[in-house]
Interface confidence: low
């Protein structure tokens, strides 16, 4: 099972019960010898291919529980026939074995008598038959092949015998490992319950953190919801406040520039008049009457009309009225009002903290009480009672096993010794056959007569006959052992080991009223005296294998319902009711009447009605009627064309004066005109659509104010609910986790399933039955093949 999920619990907030590590392996690996065991399983499948007889076994067990069995009853006869039908393969093998047991000593006895009377081979022929050598070769090869087959069987026998010894030695360690795991289960369970309780503090701390940070968690949530609707309006007003300041600066610059221009233009006009007077005076020089100087003087005289300043510069109107209006607007600190707006928003978290102190304390009280409730519930869990009873059972079983293990090991050594004797006996017979073949082949002389043949050849024949004699003597005894071990081993494999692995055995044991005629379900009757409660061996075993907790596996909810006792809804309900009393009142400031009037006054200040074009037209004109610098250079050139003297000198002086006027008078005017242009442009930009902008801002302000009036309370309610869901989510998630852990994880009964696997699958089937079956398979194979070996040897 996975973790329980809670909608509001943060995804990262997952609890995990510390894993319990068990020593005993889940499965037993046979290693390379497993191939031999598999070979025996295949043989058993051929002998006994039928499915596990669930019904037959049920009926058989029911009959076995009956005090007196009536063998004449038809159902008893049918049951007997069913058993015979299922066991047919094994019965057939037993019949063949019994025939072997009966016939081999008889045949041996008669053969011995016959041989003594020189009737059954052994007579000497002077002349060989034509096919004699060929037949001899065939017999020798056949005997060799059969001896190899017998050797393989003997090898299986030795391996099986060795396996029993080594595996039984391992059983003590295996038992200890299982008991250690069962003790771990018993010891870990109280620790797991303590751990579950300890997690409550973690959950509570998380909730307390959120409660202590209510300013940022709830207040911040409210703030984040309100900000997008309020901040943009405050931003627009702030930008308008900046625009008002910029307008004031531009108007001040413009006014001072206009005053400067008026003054500078007057000074330029005065300077030009003065230089014109000087030039006229110079041109009265007698030299101007003389040709070609007169042409030059006339040219200069004609150009004097160009030396004029632009009179319109002195006529540009000032902007005092507009500046006064803007200064009046600036009397209200719009920036400060906006700052107050921002401040009222940023104060939300602190206001939330101040207003929720009592509620937070109440929730904390409830959370502390939930902890002790959970403690009470876990103390009343029946897991501990079951484990206490189980502990007694574990102790008894352990002492029983430790008491009887030495006896088992003693019996094992007898088995091992017996097996060794059987395998050695077979080995002896087969060695005689091998020696007979070896001596016969090595000592054979084609030209020798029976009376003159060599010692080696003769010994070979003796060895073969000793092998035959031993075969007749012991093979029937070996076959008795084979038949007995086969019947036992094959049935245990087919009726216990295989159905245990496939869980069919559990299905038989789970048959209602089978193990106890008063109980429908044996386990529930045994554990709870509630035999109607469906608790099956198969389900319990499967759940334990899956590492499921005892509570869920044994359906303990029928005797103690953890969900009812934990009562998640009641706990979350008490938190909810505390949260319902959470009330937050906010006072968000947005500009106010003074701020609105301020914006409206600015819209009416007149900067949008100024005649900007008349100002811009003057900024494009030259301050004087002509480029004074060009005029000065031209005058200088003309003066230089005159002969040296007073006229030339005075004209050059005037040219220099004009250059100075350009430097000192014209350039500052041009600078002022540039400043005027920039100020006008700023005002034009600010004034453009000013009324519409202010109208739009006021509309946005109304919208924001409406939003605050109509939505703040719903935002607070929504965020409070969300906050509450988060707090409750922690506990819902925790309580669901407790329910899940106690049901699915605490006191995981895996060691019980592992112990059962160890007893049946590992100890009985892998340690005893598999080697036993391999033993009869190998020895049986060797014994059966003694018959053809014996024939070919003779």
């Amino acid at each position: 099972g996975g973790q329980p999920s809670s909608t509001d619990a943060p995804k990262a907030w997952n609890y995990e019960l510390p894993a319990t590590n068990y020593e005993t392996q889940d499965s037993h690996k046979a290693g390379p010898i497993g191939i031999l065991f598999e070979l025996v399983h295949i043989f058993l499948y051929v002998v006994q291919p039928r499915d596990f007889p669930e019904d037959t076994l049920r009926k058989f067990l029911q009959k076995a529980y009956e005090s007196k069995i009536d063998y004449d009853k038809p159902e008893t006869v049918i049951l007997g026939l069913k058993i015979v039908y299922y066991e047919a393969g094994i019965i057939l093998c037993c019949v063949l074995g019994l025939l072997f047991i009966i016939l081999m000593p008889l045949v041996g006895y008669f053969f011995c008598m016959c041989r003594c009377c020189n009737k059954c081979g052994g007579e000497m022929h002077q002349r060989q038959k034509e096919n004699g050598p060929f037949l001899r070769k065939c017999f020798a090869i056949s005997l060799l092949v059969i001896c190899i087959i017998i050797s393989i069987g003997i090898f299986y026998g030795f391996v099986a015998n060795h396996q029993v010894r080594t595996r039984i030695k391992r059983s003590r360690k295996l038992a200890d490992s299982n008991f250690k795991d069962l003790r771990t289960l018993l010891n870990e369970t109280p620790e797991q319950i303590k751990y579950i309780l300890a997690q409550y503090n973690t959950t509570k701390d998380k909730a307390f953190t959120d409660l202590n940070s209510i300013n940022s968690v709830l207040g911040g949530g409210i703030l984040d919801r309100l900000r997008p609707n309020i901040i943009p309006v405050l931003d627009e007003i702030k930008s308008m406040a900046t625009a008002i300041k910029e307008t004031k600066e531009a108007l001040e610059n413009m006014n001072s520039t206009l005053k400067s221009l008026h003054q500078q233009s007057t000074q330029l006009s005065s300077s030009l008049t003065s230089v014109k007077t000087s030039l006229r005076s110079s041109l009265n020089d007698p030299l101007c009457l003389v040709h070609p100087s007169s042409e030059t003087c006339n040219s200069i005289r004609l150009s004097l009309s160009q030396l004029n300043s632009n009179p319109e510069l002195r006529q540009l109107p000032p902007v005092d009225a507009e500046l006064d209006n803007v200064n009046n607007v600036l009397r209200t600190d719009l920036d400060g009002l906006v700052q107050q707006g921002y401040q009222s928003l940023n104060d939300i978290p602190d206001r939330v903290q101040r207003q929720t102190t009592t509620v937070v304390a109440g929730i904390k009280r409830v959370l502390n009480s939930i902890g002790s409730d959970i403690d009470n519930v876990t103390q009343r869990l029946p897991i501990q009672d079951i484990l206490s009873a189980f502990s007694v059972y574990v102790n008894n079983t352990e002492s029983y096993i430790h008491r009887n293990l030495p006896t088992l090991e003693e019996y094992d050594s007898y088995w091992w010794l017996g097996g060794l004797v059987i395998c050695s006996l077979l080995t002896l017979i087969v060695i005689f056959y091998y020696l007979g073949l070896l001596c016969g082949v090595c000592g054979y002389d084609r030209h020798a007569t029976p009376t003159t043949r060599g010692c080696v050849s003769n010994t070979g024949g003796v060895f073969l006959m000793v092998g035959v004699g031993l075969s007749f003597l012991f093979c029937w005894i070996l076959m008795i052992i084979v038949v007995l071990t086969f019947v036992f081993g094959a049935n245990v494999e087919k009726l216990i080991c295989e159905p245990y692995t496939s869980k069919e055995l559990f299905r038989v044991l789970d048959t209602p009223y089978l193990l106890n005629e008063d109980w429908e379900y044996y386990l529930s009757g045994k554990l709870f005296n509630k035999s109607k409660m469906k608790l099956t061996f198969e389900q319990v075993y499967s759940d334990c294998k899956k590492n499921r907790g005892t509570y869920g596996t044994l359906h303990l909810q029928n005797s103690f319902n953890i969900s009812e006792h934990l009562n998640i809804n009641e706990h979350t309900g008490s938190i909810s009711s505390e949260l319902e009393s959470l009330k937050v009142n906010l006072n968000i400031f947005l500009l106010g009447a003074a701020g609105r009037k301020n914006l409206q006054d600015f819209a009416a200040c007149g900067i949008d009605r100024m005649n900007y074009d008349s100002y811009l037209a003057q900024t494009g004109k030259s301050p004087a009627g002509v480029n004074l610098l060009s005029f000065a250079y031209d005058l200088e050139a003309k003066a230089n064309s005159l002969p040296p003297g007073n006229l030339r000198n005075s004209l050059k002086r005037d040219a220099q004066t004009i250059k100075t006027i350009h430097q000192q008078r014209v350039l500052p005017i041009e600078q002022s005109l540039s400043t005027l242009y920039q100020s006008v442009k700023i005002l034009q930009r600010t004034g453009n659509g000013l009324l519409e902008r202010v109208t739009r801002i006021l509309a946005s302000l109304d919208f924001a104010q409406n939003f605050i009036t109509n939505n703040t309370s719903s935002v607070i309610i929504e965020e409070t609910k969300k906050y509450g869901r988060t707090i409750i989510g922690y506990f819902e998630h925790y309580l669901q986790w407790i329910e899940f852990s106690i049901s699915e994880k605490v006191a995981s009964c895996k060691p019980v399933a592992t112990a059962l696997d160890t007893a049946v699958d590992v100890f009985l089937c892998s340690y005893i039955i598999d080697p036993l079956n391999l033993f009869w398979f190998g020895i049986g194979k060797a014994t059966v093949f003694l018959l053809p070996a014996l024939i070919f040897a003779v």
Partner: antibody, heavy 120, light 110 residues
């Protein structure tokens, strides 16, 4: 224009208290904003220490909470930092800053003093 | 508590080169509250980029900022000599109430 100027001793003995003053010109500390102290350690790491709000309320870095106190004198437009039980770890350059909490700076520090180097 | 990690700690760039430095938060941060400061040796830090992407007054247009969630960056489209300085990212955190600074990225001329 707003200007901030830190002053105080450049050398303090371990276990003594460190006291610094921040004089603000061009703006009244009661009119708005948070007035904060930041320090920069020799490795250039910056650490916020705490602030005093325009309304006189405080907030401190949890790591300094038990040792720090930020107060003000509204008549002189000054902010004071007091750090108790100093150790060599408190050697740093201490800056006085203005925290602009509204839009558009959202808790950005738009004005900083030139800083005062303090060695413990 | 959120931690701001700036990378790289030191970087060098040629004049005219495009430069990007990053600031990674250990958990998600509101872009409103993420700012960048520039500090030249011997002087105090200056607010350089506010609220993730807005340039403070007087900051050349070659600077830009971007990011959201846990990853933020400052980019200089074409490096100039005067851009050599240390840049710090800074974040305001509501709970617990804190102002955090990154460790800084020192930008040098190659």
């Amino acid at each position: 224009d707003v200007q901030l100027q830190e002053s105080g001793p450049g050398l303090v003995k371990p276990s003594q208290s460190l006291s610094l003053t921040c004089s603000v010109t061009g703006y009244s500390i009661t009119s708005g904003y948070y007035w904060s102290w930041i320090r920069q350690f020799p490795g250039n790491k910056l650490e916020w220490m705490g602030y005093i709000s325009y309304d006189g309320s405080n907030n401190y870095n949890p790591s300094l909470k038990n040792r720090i106190s930020i107060t003000r004198d509204t008549s002189k437009n000054q902010i004071f930092l007091k750090l108790n039980s100093v150790t060599t770890e408190d050697t740093a350059t201490y800056y006085c800053t203005r925290v602009y909490f509204g839009h558009p700076y959202y808790y950005g520090m738009d004005y900083w003093g030139q800083g005062i180097s303090v060695t413990v | 508590q959120i931690v701001l990690t700036q990378s790289p700690a030191i970087m060098s760039a040629s004049l005219g080169e495009r430069v990007t430095m990053t600031c990674t938060a250990s958990s998600s941060v509101s872009s409103f509250y993420l700012h960048w400061y520039r500090q030249k040796p011997g002087s105090s830090p200056k607010l350089w980029i506010y609220s993730t992407s807005n340039l403070a007054s007087g900051v050349p247009a070659r600077f830009s900022g971007s990011g959201s969630g846990t990853s933020y960056s400052l980019t200089i489209s074409s490096m100039e000599a005067e851009d050599a300085a240390t840049y710090y990212c800074h974040q305001y955190h509501r709970s617990p109430y804190m102002y955090m600074f990154g460790g800084g990225t020192k930008l040098e001329i190659k």
